[in-house]
């Protein structure tokens, strides 16, 4: 009862709930993350504890600065939920739950090209597929290192497709595609596929 009264004596705005956050919310297995437990009250000596579901991960004391808990996300269950507790004497408050999203990185996609050759034009269909990685996957097609398509989102394990028509070119064109999912700063590219210039029988991807 005494503990409850002590805590009630502290006004809510004087000792609100702490905030639990991480700069990285989308992670892949094996990634190291830092979790920050902070409190608006900068004058109190606060004891911070971090929990995941119903296990205790650590305790730190702090005043004015957030407590930083460094973890490695190696198993699916380590996505969370996490919560932190801020405690001053007998008064404690809990943060809202925080969970990471674990995403498998995309593997290098495979680019396939199909061409229908006419006398004046080439009708090119590009297919791009990454066989591994958490969905959805965004695919972007490039010609000579310049994006020629918007990001095409695929929510199933099917290739992205992009069609273009070109006047029969006089020089080689190099195509590649990029695969990217929710993992920040993590994109993979296909091997480049070179389309030779016209002239003679030099269209290996053409449908005859």
């Amino acid at each position: 009862r005494k503990a409850v009264l002590d805590c009630e004596a502290m006004k809510t705005n004087e000792f609100p709930s702490p905030c639990l956050d991480s700069k990285t919310k989308v992670v892949m297995k094996g990634q190291n993350v830092s979790m920050f437990c902070s409190h608006k009250n900068k004058s109190l000596q606060i004891t911070y504890s971090l929990f995941r579901r119903k296990t205790h991960l650590g305790t730190q004391d702090g005043k004015g600065e957030p407590a930083i808990f460094n973890l490695s996300i190696t198993e699916a269950h380590e996505s969370g939920p996490y919560k932190c507790k801020a405690q001053v004497t007998s008064c404690s408050k809990y943060s809202r739950d925080f969970s990471f999203t674990i995403v498998d990185p995309v593997t290098s996609p495979v680019l396939n090209i199909m061409v229908i050759q006419t006398e004046t034009d080439r009708h090119i269909t590009l297919h791009c597929l990454s066989v591994n990685g958490s969905l959805p996957i965004n695919y972007t097609f490039f010609e000579n290192h310049v994006a020629i398509s918007p990001a095409i989102s695929k929510y199933d394990r099917e290739p992205a497709e992009f069609n273009l028509t070109k006047k029969n070119p006089g020089e080689e064109e190099e195509y590649r595609c990029e695969a990217k999912n929710r993992l920040p700063n993590y994109a993979t590219y296909s091997h480049p596929v070179t389309m030779p210039s016209t002239g003679g029988d030099s269209c290996p991807f053409c449908l005859k």
Epitope: K54, T55, H56, G58, E75
Partner: antibody
Framework: EVQLVESGGGLVQPGGSLRLSCAAS????????ITWVRQAPGKGLEWIGT???????YYSTWAKGRFTISRDNSKNTVYLQMNSLRAEDTAVYYC?????????????WGQGTLVTVSS | DIQMTQSPSSLSASVGDRVTITCQSS????????LSWYQQKPGKAPKLLIY???RLASGVPSRFSGSGSGTDFTLTISSLQPEDFATYYC????????????FGTGTKVTVL
């Protein structure tokens, strides 16, 4: 098969020490928590302490100082070091595994090992 | 120290009876539901019945149920079976003064 096997129990004199072992098989101690529980003859269950997947240890008030829990990941074994033993420490000692991320939902138990403290 | 008091400490009942055991804690358990129930038979290790105060552990018959929150919890056996005569314990998890666990005092269920 997932199982825990305790060993190291026996007769010890008051003031003596004993180290109990809890060998885990079928799972890794780097993911699961292990808890030691004891039961004196004809009495109830008593929580001694816990070592979680991160290696953090937690003890009941009465066990702190006299009892120490440790683990050897290479042997997949948890230990309970008991010092300054007294007659009232006579009990069956169990180790038990918790659910993932739930230290005290003890769903796998060893068979127990009897410790008798007597002169 | 945290006290976990079970009542009654013992009870006699017949097959088919509805049995209720209560567990009262001197402090709120962590998350208001960090409580489990165990069944123990003589010479055997305890067996997990209920976790999260009300969730049935794998392989446990549905005649067992749990309820409660904070400091007061109940284990109910809707229709007592011959194999249910045993001693029952609650176990609470706490974070008020460190990370801590405590068993209840136990309830022995015997044949009437």
């Amino acid at each position: 098969e997932v199982q825990l096997v305790e060993s190291g129990g026996g007769l010890v004199q008051p003031g003596g020490s004993l180290r109990l072992s809890c060998a885990a098989s079928g799972f890794s101690l780097t993911i699961y928590t292990i808890t030691w529980v004891r039961q004196a003859p004809g009495k109830g269950l008593e929580w001694i302490g816990t070592i979680n997947s991160y290696g953090n240890t937690y003890y009941s008030t009465w066990a702190k100082g006299r009892f120490t829990i440790s683990r050897d990941n290479s042997k997949n074994t948890v230990y309970l070091q008991m010092n300054s033993l007294r007659a009232e420490d006579t009990a069956v000692y169990y180790c038990a595994r918790g659910y993932v991320d739930s230290d005290w939902y003890l769903n796998i138990w060893g068979q127990g090992t009897l410790v008798t403290v007597s002169s | 120290d945290i006290q976990m008091t079970q009542s009654p400490s013992s009870l006699s009942a017949s097959v088919g009876d509805r049995v209720t055991i209560t567990c009262q804690s001197s402090e709120s358990v962590y998350d208001n539901n960090y409580l489990s129930w165990y069944q123990q038979k003589p010479g055997k290790a305890p067996k997990l019945l209920i976790y999260d105060a009300s969730r049935l552990a794998s392989g446990v018959p549905s005649r067992f149920s749990g309820s409660g929150s904070g400091t007061d919890f109940t284990l109910t056996i809707s229709s007592l079976q011959p194999e249910d005569f045993a001693t029952y314990y609650c176990l609470g998890g706490y974070d008020s003064s460190g990370w801590y666990a405590a068993f209840g005092t136990g309830t022995k269920v015997t044949v009437l």
